[in-house]
């Protein structure tokens, strides 16, 4: 009975999410493998988040709006491990917007989800950020490594969206 009611609950939750995400990819996790964590297909998952690489070239504002429509934000990178996971799926000759900007040009960088900007956990390329005119951050491959660079916000780039996993 317990298992049956849990399955019914899951199915109704799945139906609820299906109006937003036509397809979900779920894996069993948790202590007793009783919890399912899901990401929209074809998003990838890492720890408690889902990631989507958008190859549509758009300005930073339009990229953020695009993520928002999907229930996500431009990516907020919190650890080196997270960045390493993300960059496995990026093309080395492309640049991708992050959810990091400095809208007033005061070098007060802020993440879209209001996560505090921690200077000790940043991965700027050497010499970056280098211009208060360039108020949005990208991740790109330079000098044999992935890192961040400040760029003009209105210049179209690819982007990375991030959302919390859906638990059912």
């Amino acid at each position: 009975n317990f298992m049956y009611s849990k399955t019914v609950k899951r199915l109704s939750k799945l139906q609820e999410y299906q109006q937003y995400y036509p397809s979900l990819t779920c894996v069993m996790e948790g202590k007793d493998m009783e919890d399912w964590s899901c990401c929209p297909t074809p998003w990838t998952s890492f720890q408690s988040s889902c990631y989507f690489i958008s190859t549509v070239m758009q300005s930073w504002t339009k990229s953020q709006n695009n993520c928002s429509v999907m229930g996500a934000d431009l990516v907020v990178i919190n650890t080196k491990e997270e960045q390493d996971f993300i960059t496995q799926n990026l093309k080395i000759n492309s640049a991708y917007f992050l959810g990091l900007s400095d809208p007033k040009g005061w070098r007060h960088w802020q993440w879209v989800d209001q996560t505090p900007y921690n200077k000790n956990v940043t991965f700027w390329h050497s010499g970056e950020p280098n211009s208060p005119d360039e108020r949005c951050a990208i991740i790109n491959f330079r000098s044999e490594e992935w890192g961040w660079n400040d760029v003009h916000c209105h210049v179209p780039q690819k982007s990375i969206c991030k959302m919390k996993k859906i638990y059912i």
């Epitope: 300005s59 504002t61 005119d133 003009h152």
Partner: antibody, heavy 121, light 111 residues
């Protein structure tokens, strides 16, 4: 007082090349992003190129990409536009302008008087 | 590309009367409470001059008879009391996304 003085325009044959210059004074040129905008005779305005303050990022519309190159020499307070493979439709007055950011967008706040480029055989 | 459509193409207004110019973007140029539309004035034989930025902010040194309004896709430049020196072509421009694009211009004349 901000001053921008364009030079280098003239008559050139289709397929030819020309280099425009913009001499800047009255502001700290090396800290400003700069742009070129053009205006065909009797027509509207068209953005042509932008370069960031350090000269390491350049941007172009598809209409000139691969043919035009924007560059700058901060030691000489000068902006350049190298125009290759010129076409009749590139005939226009070319203006250089200073770029001022506004949150996630920008404005072109100071403009030079322009230099005329005519592409004709 | 974002297309900026201005109307009317030309406008004849009596001195001291109000002039209104419209600009429509093919998609929204707003984000987080700001609109990325600028207005420029170009007098014959002169370069463009910035009047309004961010849809409604008056550039320093511009007379306050000029004002801008609008959001999303629809924007307006208003000259509250037309003066002889306002005879010019007026352009809207979006800076939300490259390529920056301008409207086709509106010529303002004295009736």
């Amino acid at each position: 007082e901000v001053q921008l003085l364009e030079s280098g325009g003239g008559l050139v044959q289709p397929g030819g090349s020309l280099r425009l210059s913009c001499a800047a004074s009255g502001f700290t040129f090396s800290t400003y992003t700069m742009s070129w905008v053009r205006q065909a005779p009797g027509k509207g305005l068209e953005w042509v190129a932008t370069i960031n303050s350090g000269g390491d990022n350049t941007y172009y519309p598809d209409s000139v990409k691969g043919r035009f190159t924007i560059s700058r020499d901060n030691s000489k307070n000068t902006l350049y536009l190298q125009m290759n493979s010129l076409r009749a439709e590139d005939t226009a007055v070319y203006y250089c302008a200073t770029y001022r950011p506004y949150y996630y967008g920008s404005v072109l706040d100071y403009w030079g008087q322009g230099t005329t480029v005519t592409v004709s055989s | 590309d974002i297309v900026m459509t201005q109307s009317p193409d030309s406008l004849a207004v009596s001195l001291g009367e109000r002039a209104t110019i419209n600009c429509k973007a093919s998609q929204s140029v707003d984000y987080d409470g700001n609109s990325y539309v600028n207005w420029y004035q170009q007098k014959p034989g002169q370069p463009p001059k910035l009047l309004i930025y961010g849809a409604s902010n008056l550039e320093s040194g511009i007379p306050d008879r000029f004002s801008g309004s609008g959001s999303g896709t629809d924007f307006t430049l208003t000259i509250s009391s037309l003066q002889a020196e306002d005879v010019a072509v007026y352009y809207c421009q979006q800076s939300d996304e490259d390529p920056w694009t301008f409207g086709g211009g509106t010529k303002v004349e004295i009736k």
